[in-house]
């Protein structure tokens, strides 16, 4: 079946970073509107965008209830125009999304270096623990709260005067590295979930260099 003069949605795509999750689709509506529903494999369908002309729908509120569940969405198409002229239009067209498991698939957002502190020939580099929209007991969890030891950070660091990079890894949000006394270093970090098969790495953080405001230096 289906509805006269409507086009089924297509290219249903999940866009998700740090669990902020949007479903996008095509086409831009011409004389039609959409309703989006989301469900877990075992749950009821829940409407999130009802009779909308948008071609995206924010499903974050639903997926953060259990980020380890697998979700499916569907987009229904209806004819637009004057409401009273459409009446009962029969079964609407709909298209299913790909399945989406937030814990395994959400993109890791670009991390930020919160601070670095030099004490002699050691530098402590701290990565900001970004807040997500996942809640527990009415508080928002951080990325580390959600992923625990599944999440590691890779630090890239190099002398300001050269291009040779060194790396360090941590399963906390802090690095303690050895540096040469009297040398300035630059740092960049990347979030990684080694156990994943897709979306394993974030983009690199902005570079921060010693001798700039973020750092704190104590010569001992």
């Amino acid at each position: 079946s289906g509805t006269t003069n409507t086009v089924a949605a297509y290219n249903l795509t999940w866009k998700s970073t740090n669990f902020k999750t949007i479903l996008e689709w095509e086409p831009k509506p011409v004389n039609q509107v959409y309703t989006v529903q989301i469900s877990t494999k075992s749950g009821d369908w829940k409407s999130k965008c009802f009779y909308t002309t948008d071609t995206e729908c924010d499903l974050t509120d639903e997926i953060v209830k259990d980020v380890k569940q697998t979700y499916l969405a569907r987009v229904f198409s209806y004819p637009a125009g004057n409401v009273e002229s459409t009446g009962s239009a029969g079964e609407p067209l709909y298209e299913n999304s790909p399945e989406f498991t937030p814990y395994l698939e959400t993109n890791l957002g670009q991390p930020t270096i919160q601070s670095f502190e030099q004490v002699g020939t050691k530098v402590n580099v701290t990565v900001e623990d970004e807040r997500t929209l996942v809640r527990r007991n009415n508080t928002f969890l951080s990325l580390r709260d959600v992923f625990g030891k599944d999440l590691i950070y890779t630090l890239y660091y190099w002398k300001s005067s050269s291009s040779g990079k060194k790396t360090a890894k941590t399963n906390t949000n802090e690095f303690l590295i050895d540096v040469d006394k009297g040398e300035n270093y630059c740092f960049s970090v990347q979030a990684v979930i080694p156990s994943r098969t897709v979306n394993r790495k974030s983009t690199d953080s902005p570079v921060e260099c010693m001798g700039q405001e973020k750092g704190e230096f104590r010569e001992i």
């Epitope: 529903q37 829940k46 409407s47 009802f50 009962s88 079964e91």
Partner: nanobody
């Protein structure tokens, strides 16, 4: 005669409140999901709120969340939309519609004739 009839619309100042009613005659509402849909002049219709037939689960569009409340009284065969803190952009014809669905109707077996809501100072 089988129909849905909306009432409770009218002219209200910004910040004011209205309570819309959607009453069914000729059939019982309690087995249907009910949706409120509005259509502003020159715009496409927009889903505002829904309520399920079973567990009372509700849906609100982002533009009305926290301001509008939907509930149903099956004994009176009526669904209500309480609209608070109204804004000029809420001005539209409001329709109720009934159909099967877990919270919002997925097809529309019955439509009301619509009621005008105007928010203006």
């Amino acid at each position: 005669q089988v129909q849905l009839v909306e009432s409770g619309g009218g002219l209200v100042q910004p910040g004011g409140s209205l309570r819309l009613s959607c009453a069914a005659s000729g059939f019982t509402l309690d087995t249907y999901a009910i949706g409120w849909i509005r259509q502003a002049p020159g715009k496409e219709r927009e889903g505002v709120s829904c309520i399920s037939s079973t567990d009372g689960s509700t849906y609100y569009a982002a533009s009305v969340k926290g301001r509008f409340t939907i509930n149903r009284d099956n004994a009176k065969n009526t669904v209500y939309l309480q609209m608070n803190s109204l804004k000029p952009e809420d001005t539209a014809v409001y329709y109720c519609a009934a159909g099967p669905g877990t919270d919002c109707p997925l097809r529309f077996d019955y439509w009301g004739q619509g009621i005008q809501v105007t928010v203006s100072s």
